[in-house]
């Protein structure tokens, strides 16, 4: 094959090599960019910046090598369009630093930075951590900071991510109230901060105020849906990112729903209760307090993390006709109480039979030590036990 005269030449089925001295000053409009998985660049002293737009359209890129070139700056979002990047070699350039944001979101198996005049400051704490944790082949490079010494020796006691404190109202919050949250940000080299409100949806009207180091957030006309929803304050500095999430408890009265009993492994009378604070529950059976036992008990389903409503069952272990009746669930919290009732029929009463019908009689003696938990009808005046077969 004839030698390729271009600045960049194909290499294999999906690779490109750009090695002609000084031919590139940016990576715009590389031929066949959308299918490239490998890009090798060398001896490009005019290539000094790597920005977001440079790698747009290189969505399939796995390996990027820019070596012995003039690279001085890599933008924090430079690799936004190359999420599959797994090998990044930027050795022997003019890089003094590289932001933690540059590699965030990538699953780099290899990151090569040797031969750069790196400058140690807290901005390289993330790289020092990679070295400590043996990530990306960094330890083998024994990276040096220009004029200082090994990256491994850089002091890092003051290299922390921002510290966040979110103040929430102490007093009870009611539906319709306005709530002011304040996020206090501390730390060195603060760059950006804000709120993440994705969970809120229609739970309140949101108004942001202030800026670093004190961010305000007003949640106006709150609804009960705000409960269990995360309101997150975040902040970034040159070391990394910190997030703190809080929840605002909006008080509202108890409510309850009951559903028709269903037969599962045990019988279940399904219910849903809601309220903030979480209501206390009491069951009534035919108007009297139902004392729970190991045969009749309340069981909750795993709660959803982002809502106050609790779903569950009144579980009945092999109920008989004696358990038929009216079940009422009472729910109460300081803001109100609610109840719901439902009729449940688990089986017919075997003693409500037509005199014409034959009586099934068993001639086995009554087992007085029964531990089955099934109700056993005993007639003292007769030596015979009447057994009821329960399916």
């Amino acid at each position: 094959a004839a030698p390729c005269p271009d600045a960049c030449c194909p290499h294999g089925s999906s690779g490109l090599r750009c090695t002609r001295d000084g031919a590139l000053d940016s990576l715009h409009h590389l031929p066949g960019a959308e299918n490239l998985t490998e890009l090798y660049i060398e001896n490009q002293q005019h290539l000094q910046h790597l920005e977001l737009r440079d790698l747009r359209g290189l969505g399939e890129l796995r390996n990027l090598t820019i070596v012995k070139s003039g690279l001085r700056f890599v933008a924090p979002d430079a690799f936004h369009f190359t999420p599959r990047l797994s090998r990044l070699n930027l050795s022997f350039n003019a890089l003094e630093s590289l932001s933690w944001k540059t590699v965030q979101g990538l699953s780099l198996q290899e990151l090569v930075l040797s031969g750069n005049p790196l400058h140690c400051s807290c901005a390289l704490r993330w790289l020092q951590r990679w070295e400590e944790e043996g990530l990306g082949g960094v330890p083998e490079q024994k990276l040096q900071c220009h004029g200082q010494g090994p990256l491994a020796h850089m002091p890092n006691a003051s290299c922390g991510v921002p510290t966040l404190k979110v103040q929430v109202p102490n007093a009870s919050v009611d539906v319709g109230d306005d709530v002011l949250l304040r996020c206090q940000v501390e730390g060195r080299g603060l760059e950006q901060a804000g709120w993440i409100l994705t969970e809120l949806e229609q739970s309140a009207t949101v108004m942001k105020s202030g800026g670093l180091p004190s961010l305000g957030l007003t949640l106006a006309n709150v609804t009960s849906d705000l409960n269990r929803k995360n309101v997150t304050c975040w902040a970034e500095n040159d070391v990394g990112r910190a997030e703190v999430s809080v929840q605002v408890n909006v008080s509202f009265p108890a409510s309850v729903q009951l559903h028709t009993a269903v037969e599962m492994h045990h019988w279940c009378i399904p219910f849903s209760v809601d309220g903030q604070p979480a209501p206390s529950l009491r069951w009534l059976f035919n108007g009297s307090v139902l004392n729970e036992t190991s045969f009749i008990f309340t069981e909750f389903l795993e709660p959803a993390a982002n809502e106050t409503v609790r779903h569950g069952c009144l579980r009945l272990n092999q109920p008989t006709h004696v358990n038929n009746g009216n079940y009422t669930l009472l729910a109460a919290n300081p803001f109100g109480q609610a109840s719901a009732s439902i009729m449940a029929a688990f089986m017919d009463n075997p003693f409500e039979f037509n005199p014409e019908d034959p009586i099934p009689v068993s001639f086995s003696p009554v087992d007085t030590n029964s531990t089955s938990g099934d109700p056993v009808e005993k007639k003292d005046e007769t030596p015979f036990g009447v057994s009821v077969a329960v399916g």
Epitope: A123, G149, H153, G189
Partner: antibody, heavy 119, light 106 residues
Framework: QVQLVQSGAEVKKPGASVKVSCKAS????????MHWVRQAPGQGLEWIGT????????SYAQKFQGRVTLTRDTSTSTAYMELSSLRSEDTAVYYC????????????WGQGTTVTVSS | DIQMTQSPSSLSASVGDRVTITCRAS?????LYWFQQKPGKAPKPLIY???TLGSGVPSRFSGSGSGTDYTLTISSLQPEDFATYYC?????????FGGGTKVEIK
């Protein structure tokens, strides 16, 4: 103990060059970056540049780029700072100092070399 | 370049006084160094990365601060402490020094 001993005072004419030496002892010369800092009479401290004796890697302050050259001789554990095209405002005391990476600071300084530029 | 501004540029104090010198960086830095210099002598390291005392430095010296604002405190000034004090940053190239604070006898 660790010591940096600098060459003696120099008087130079404008336009000339001066080469100041800094002899290191008491440690492994090739393992630590050597820096050069100057102080004009009655003024503060000003960083000139640095050299890594292990491989002659250098870095210079923008202000001195093209006029200063840092070199070293590992056989004698000596670092050199040469400043060319001297002008009167280069009159200063020139110091060499070692950057001690174990504790991350300029721990040992030479005694200083006075360079006077005068016609 | 990051500018380092020291204040005051000079102060007069008596033996036993508590002395505070401040150093402000033009942008946030990772850590700070303090040097002491006496006439005709090379600078002597006092404090490295913000608050650690150099070897042989008496405990009356202390350093604190973060971000852009840093402080050197001498809790009880001694006769040998009359000198010029410099702060220095190396958060980014080039390393830069403050203009100095001269501590004189009142």
């Amino acid at each position: 103990q660790v010591q940096l001993v600098q060459s003696g005072a120099e008087v130079k004419k404008p336009g000339a060059s001066v080469k100041v030496s800094c002899k290191a002892s008491g440690y492994t010369f090739t393992e630590y970056w050597m820096h050069w800092v100057r102080q004009a009479p009655g003024q503060g401290l000003e960083w000139i540049g640095t050299i890594y004796p292990g491989n002659s890697d250098t870095s210079y302050a923008q202000k001195f780029q093209g006029r200063v050259t840092l070199t070293r001789d590992t056989s004698t554990s000596t670092a050199y700072m040469e400043l060319s095209s001297l002008r009167s405002e280069d009159t200063a005391v020139y110091y060499c100092t070692r950057f001690y990476f174990e504790d991350w600071y300029f721990d040992v300084w030479g005694q200083g070399t006075t360079v006077t530029v005068s016609s | 370049d990051i500018q380092m501004t020291q204040s005051p540029s000079s102060l007069s104090a008596s033996v036993g006084d508590r002395v505070t010198i401040t150093c402000r960086a033009s942008s946030s830095i990772s850590w700070l160094y303090w040097f002491q210099q006496k006439p005709g002598k090379a600078p002597k390291p006092l404090i490295y990365y913000t608050s650690t005392l150099g070897s042989g430095v008496p405990s009356r010296f202390s350093g604190s601060g973060s971000g852009t604002d840093y402080t050197l405190t001498i809790s009880s000034l001694q006769p040998e402490d009359f000198a010029t004090y410099y702060c220095q940053q190396w958060h980014s190239y080039p390393p830069t020094f403050g203009g100095g604070t001269k501590v004189e006898i009142k």
